[in-house]
């Protein structure tokens, strides 16, 4: 599914980093880990030191400030989670610094963060019906729902 073209005129301005060094566990209690330089995957870990630690940066939309829009960065790196298309793995994109302003095609760096109880969902701003998801024997990807797992638990203060 192509990104919604009407999003291109919405500007997202960086506010600040709101979370540092947290781990994402899916509903099967699998942690997100690095698969390789480009991709992420999920695995059941005995030692959470092997899990990817993320930072979360908050953005404000020029269109509506009531929604929580975030960027996900691997802690202590310049690698950012980037959406592709449905059922495609999310990519790790290297950037010299966190973008101060995001608009147009760059919205594949942004996610709507929704919490409900202990569940956390990350919907792609570029693909509003797709979530960051884990899938058995596959990389972390964008998916619309089952059989992929779209809800995550945030484990904080793991550093």
């Amino acid at each position: 599914s192509a990104p919604f073209s009407f999003l291109s005129n919405v500007k997202y301005n960086f506010m600040r980093i709101i979370k540092y060094e947290f781990i994402l566990n899916d509903a099967l209690n699998q942690s997100i880990i690095r698969a390789n330089d480009q991709y992420l995957t999920a695995a059941a870990l005995h030692n959470l030191d092997e899990a990817v630690k993320f930072d979360m940066g908050a953005y404000k939309s020029s269109k509506d400030d009531a929604k929580i829009t975030v960027i996900l960065r691997i802690s202590k790196t310049q690698l950012y989670v980037t959406a592709q298309d449905e059922d495609q793995p999310v990519l790790l994109k290297e950037m010299p610094e966190i973008p101060k302003t995001i608009t147009g095609s760059e919205t594949n760096l942004l996610f709507f963060w929704e919490t409900h109880g202990t569940k956390n969902y990350f919907t792609s701003v570029a693909h509003p019906n797709l979530f960051i998801a884990t899938k058995q024997d596959y990389w972390v990807c964008l998916a619309g729902g089952p059989p992929s797992i779209t809800d995550f638990q945030i484990l904080e203060n793991q550093a």
């Epitope: 979370k19 269109k63 509506d64």
Partner: antibody, heavy 118, light 113 residues
């Protein structure tokens, strides 16, 4: 699962202030919005305001802008709602709620009855 | 502020029959960027705090019986109880959380006929 426990009933004089606390057990407010809602006797629900601690952002209904203060302690386990310049029509049950980073309530406190009477 | 208007104010339905409550917002609560309707439904029984039934207009909260369903988009929403049970007697409220201040409907009282 987060449980919200509110402070006890209060009887206040007109013109005074009341501060109601809302303690989260089994979790913290870190990832959540906190909303405060009141219900006058026999009436419906009225949204007073809320806070998203992670953003340090507070929102108020216009009617309460000047006399409502919403805060959260540093441990992110207790929220407070202070209403000043109380009037008899502020007599109501005051509820805190949380559980999402949007302003809807998944978990609710038991309510705190505030009576304003001379 | 967005005004939420519920209809009817009260409703008497026979046990096992369908109950339908409508909620209309004075402006759209659909956020086009993520295709979500920022609307919730609550049930409140006397002496108790409200209980969340539905959020995002149609997502049923865990543990809520499947006879409760939410539908609608934009400005017009419906809460349906497909087969009314005695324990469903309560006041039901819709709430928009699209923009602040968040606002509630005035409530609909559901009784047994």
């Amino acid at each position: 699962q987060v449980q919200l426990v509110q402070s006890g009933a209060e009887v206040k004089k007109p013109g005074s202030s009341v501060k109601v606390s809302c303690k989260a057990s089994g979790g913290r407010f870190t990832n959540y919005a906190i909303l405060w809602v009141r219900q006058a006797p026999g009436q419906g629900l009225q949204w007073l305001g809320g806070i998203i601690p992670i953003f340090d952002e507070t929102d108020h209904a216009q009617d309460f802008q000047d006399r409502l203060t919403i805060t959260v302690d540093e441990s992110m386990t207790t929220a407070y709602m202070e209403l000043s310049s109380l009037r008899p029509e502020d007599t109501a049950i005051y509820y805190c709620a949380t559980g999402s980073n949007s302003y809807y309530g998944l978990y609710w406190g038991q309510g705190t009855l505030v009576t304003v009477s001379s | 502020d967005i005004v939420m208007t519920q209809s009817p104010d009260s409703l008497a339905v026979s046990l096992g029959e369908r109950a339908t409550i409508n909620c209309k917002s004075s402006q759209s609560v659909l956020y086009s960027s993520n295709n979500k309707n920022y609307l919730a439904w609550y049930q409140q029984k006397p002496g108790q705090p409200p209980k969340l039934l539905i959020y995002w207009a149609s997502t049923r909260e865990s543990g809520v019986p499947d006879r409760f369903s939410g539908s609608g988009s934009g400005t017009d929403f419906t809460l349906t109880i497909s087969s009314l049970q005695a324990e469903d007697v309560a006041v039901y409220y819709c709430q928009q959380y699209y923009s602040t201040p968040s606002t509630f409907g005035q409530g609909t009282k559901v009784e047994i006929k």
